[in-house]
C-alpha cells in the first residue's frame, strides 16, 4: 500500500482580520494510525494550533467530524483572526505511540492577513508660525496589513510633493504603521486652510481614509496698524483712530500712550471677521487738545497672540488748535470697537 | 530524573576535526528538539543549532552553517555535534540543552549537559 | 536576528540587598523568554521561564517581570550562592539569543 501523504492544496490563504481562516488538509492514507495536529511555523518554536488528541483550542474547530473513524480530512476553522495570527501553516500526521511521533508533515499553507490602517492623525507644530514660514505637519496609522500602502498630502485639494514617509517595521511583522513629515509654507490666506493626509491600502476597497488638520490651529497674522486722526468733534477734541486690520488669532490687547505714558489698556472684543478668516478691530482715542501746552505724541501699541508689541505712532500738533483758559488736565472721551467695513 | 550526560574534554589541532557527544536519559528522546550552545572562554552564550530526533530536521544559527553538523542516534537517545575546520576561535566549552516538540513554555532549556570543553592548539 | 541587550554587565552587591537585572529586546517575543544562571564551574540553571513563571525549588526570592521590550529578573534578599553568572534567553524565534550575561558580585 501506498505510504501516507498529508496534502494541504492551499500554498496561501488570505483572510481579512475579524473573520474566520479556513485551513484544508487531508490525508491519503487511515494507516498508520495516529492523530493530527496542526502547527504554526517551523523548527523548534513552532506552536501548537491545534491537537486532535488532547488539549483546549477554542479558536480552532474542525471542518469535518475527524472523530470518526474513516474521516481522512482534517481542515480546521481559525475564528475572529486578528493580524498576529499570520504564517505557515502545518498540518503532521503522528503516529500513535508512548508517545506519539512525527510521521509526515503537509507542505504548510501560508495565512496572511488583511488589516484595516487605523484613522490617520495629523499633528501640527506646537507653537504657532506667521506667513512665510515653513511648518511641519506628521501623520500616522497603524496596524495595517499587508505592508504595501499609498499616502498622499494636500492643501486645500492641492497635492503637497514636499514629505517624507517610512513604514514600520523594514522587515517581517504582523502588522505595521506609516509615519508621513509634510512641509508646509504658510500664507496670509492660510487661516481657513486645511492639510489632509490620505492613506489607501487594499483593505480600504478604494475608498482611502483621510486625517485633516487646520491651519488656523497653526497659523499667527500679525496685524497692521494704521493711526489716523479725525475731523475735530467739538471745540478743543481731537478723535484719533488705530486701525488694527488682518489678524489671526483673535488674542490682541492694545495699548495708547500719550508721549510715552499709558493712557488706557483694552483687549478686542468685538471684531469683523474678514473672508480670509483674519479679524479687523478699531479703537479710537478721543484728545482735549487744550489740555496740552505742547504737541502730543500718541502711540498706538498692539501685543497679538503674546508676542513683543508692535506699534504705530501720531504727532498730534497742539498749536493749530486755541488753548483753552485754565485749564491743565487733559479730559477724554474714550471709545472703541467701532465697527469699520472694508 | 532528566540527564545529558556529555563527552569529556577535548584537545585538538587546528584544521582538524571533533565530535562531541550528548546522550539524554529520563525522558522520551523524540519528543523533543536537541539544541548545542557555544560559550567562548570568559564570553557569553551562542545558540549553535538544534535536531529533531524524529526525522533528523535541523535548524542552524547562520554563524555556524558549515561549521557544526548536527546528527542523533535514536537508538542509543544521543545527539552528536562535529565541529570542522578547527580555529582558536572555536576553543570553547559546548552545551546540549533541549526544547519539546513544538514551543511549550515549560520546556524550554530546562536542562543542560556538563559541558564539553574543547581546546584548539598546536 | 533579535538582539538581547542585558544590563549591568556586572554589579557588586551586598548580602541581604535587592538587586534587578534588566534584558532589552530588539523585537516583540512577547513572554517567550528565560533567564539562566551559570555557577562557576559552569553549571548552567533554568531559574524562570515564560518571563515570570518560577522553575520548581528555585527560592522565592527570585522574580521575573516585564515592562514593554524590558524583561527584569530581580532577586530580593540576595544570599552567598547568588553571587554568579545570570543570562536572559529569547525563544521566540530562530536564532534563540542570549544577553551578553551579569555577572554579580558580592561588595
Known amino acids: 500500500e501506498e505510504e501516507l501523504q498529508v496534502i494541504q492544496p492551499d500554498k496561501s490563504v488570505s483572510v481579512a482580520a475579524g473573520e474566520s481562516a479556513i485551513l484544508h488538509c487531508t490525508v491519503t492514507s487511515l494507516i498508520p494510525v495516529g492523530p493530527i495536529q496542526w502547527f504554526r511555523g517551523a523548527g523548534p518554536a513552532r506552536e501548537l494550533i491545534y491537537n486532535q488528541k488532547e488539549g483546549h483550542f477554542p479558536r480552532v474547530t474542525t471542518v469535518s467530524e475527524s472523530t470518526k473513524r474513516e474521516n481522512m480530512d482534517f481542515s480546521i476553522s481559525i475564528s475572529n483572526i486578528t493580524p498576529a495570527d499570520a504564517g505557515t501553516y502545518y498540518c503532521v500526521k503522528f503516529r500513535k505511540g508512548s508517545p506519539d511521533t512525527e510521521f509526515k508533515s503537509g507542505a504548510g499553507t501560508e495565512l496572511s492577513v488583511r488589516a484595516k490602517p487605523s484613522a490617520p492623525v495629523v499633528s501640527g507644530p506646537a507653537a504657532r508660525a506667521t506667513p512665510q514660514h515653513t511648518v511641519s505637519f506628521t501623520c500616522e496609522s497603524h496596524g495595517f496589513s499587508p505592508r504595501d500602502i499609498t499616502l498622499k498630502w494636500f492643501k486645500n485639494g492641492n497635492e503637497l510633493s514636499d514629505f517624507q514617509t517610512n513604514v514600520d517595521p523594514v522587515g517581517e511583522s504582523v502588522s505595521y504603521s506609516i509615519h508621513s513629515t509634510a512641509k508646509v509654507v504658510l500664507t496670509r490666506e492660510d487661516v481657513h486652510s486645511q492639510v489632509i493626509c490620505e492613506v489607501a491600502h487594499v483593505t480600504l476597497q478604494g475608498d482611502p481614509l483621510r486625517g485633516t488638520a487646520n491651519l488656523s490651529e497653526t497659523i499667527r497674522v500679525p496685524p497692521t496698524l494704521e493711526v489716523t486722526q479725525q475731523p475735530v468733534r467739538a471745540e478743543n477734541q481731537v478723535n484719533v483712530t488705530c486701525q488694527v486690520r488682518k489678524f489671526y488669532p483673535q488674542r490682541l490687547q492694545l495699548t495708547w500712550l500719550e508721549n510715552g505714558n499709558v493712557s488706557r489698556t483694552e483687549t478686542a472684543s468685538t471684531v469683523t471677521e474678514n473672508k480670509d478668516g483674519t479679524y479687523n478691530w478699531m479703537s479710537w482715542l478721543l484728545v482735549n487738545v487744550s489740555a496740552h501746552r505742547d504737541d502730543v505724541k500718541l502711540t498706538c501699541q498692539v501685543e497679538h497672540d503674546g508676542q513683543p508689541a508692535v506699534s504705530k505712532s501720531h504727532d498730534l500738533k497742539v498749536s493749530a488748535h486755541p488753548k483753552e483758559q485754565g485749564s491743565n488736565t487733559a479730559a477724554e472721551n474714550t471709545g472703541s470697537n467701532e465697527r469699520n467695513i472694508y | 530524573e532528566v540527564q545529558f550526560q556529555q563527552s569529556g574534554t577535548v584537545l585538538a589541532r587546528p584544521g582538524t576535526s571533533v565530535k562531541m557527544s550528548c546522550k539524554a536519559s529520563?525522558?522520551?528522546?523524540?519528543?523533543?528538539?536537541m539544541h548545542w550552545v557555544k560559550q567562548g572562554p570568559g564570553q557569553g552564550l551562542q545558540w549553535i543549532g538544534a535536531?529533531?530526533?524524529?526525522?533528523?530536521?535541523?535548524t542552524y544559527n547562520q554563524k555556524f552553517k558549515g561549521k557544526a553538523e548536527l546528527t542523533v542516534v535514536t537508538s542509543t537517545s544521543t545527539a552528536y555535534m562535529e565541529v570542522s575546520s578547527l580555529t582558536n576561535e572555536d576553543s570553547a566549552v559546548y552545551y546540549c540543552?533541549?526544547?519539546?516538540?513544538?514551543?511549550?513554555?515549560?520546556?524550554?532549556?530546562?536542562?543542560w549537559g556538563q559541558g564539553t570543553l574543547v581546546t584548539v592548539s598546536a | 536576528d533579535i538582539q538581547m541587550t542585558q544590563s549591568p554587565s556586572s554589579l557588586s552587591a551586598s548580602l541581604g540587598e535587592r538587586v534587578s537585572l534588566t534584558c532589552r529586546a530588539s523585537?516583540?517575543?512577547?513572554?517567550?523568554l528565560n533567564w539562566l544562571q551559570q555557577e562557576p564551574d559552569g553549571t548552567i540553571k533554568r531559574l524562570i521561564y515564560a518571563t515570570s513563571s518560577l522553575d520548581s525549588g528555585v527560592p522565592k526570592r527570585f522574580s521575573g517581570s516585564r515592562s514593554g521590550s524590558d524583561y527584569s529578573l530581580t532577586i530580593s534578599g540576595l544570599e552567598s550562592e547568588d553571587f554568579v553568572d545570570y543570562y536572559c534567553?529569547?525563544?521566540?524565534?530562530?536564532?534563540?539569543?542570549f544577553g551578553g550575561g551579569t555577572k554579580l558580585e558580592i561588595n
Open positions: 540543552t533541549r526544547s519539546f516538540y513544538y514551543s511549550l513554555d515549560a520546556a524550554w532549556f530546562v536542562y
Open positions: 523585537q516583540d517575543i512577547g513572554s517567550r
Open positions: 534567553l529569547q525563544y521566540a524565534s530562530s536564532p534563540f539569543t
Open positions: 535536531i529533531y530526533p524524529v526525522n533528523n530536521d535541523t
Open positions: 529520563g525522558s522520551t528522546f523524540t519528543s523533543y528538539w
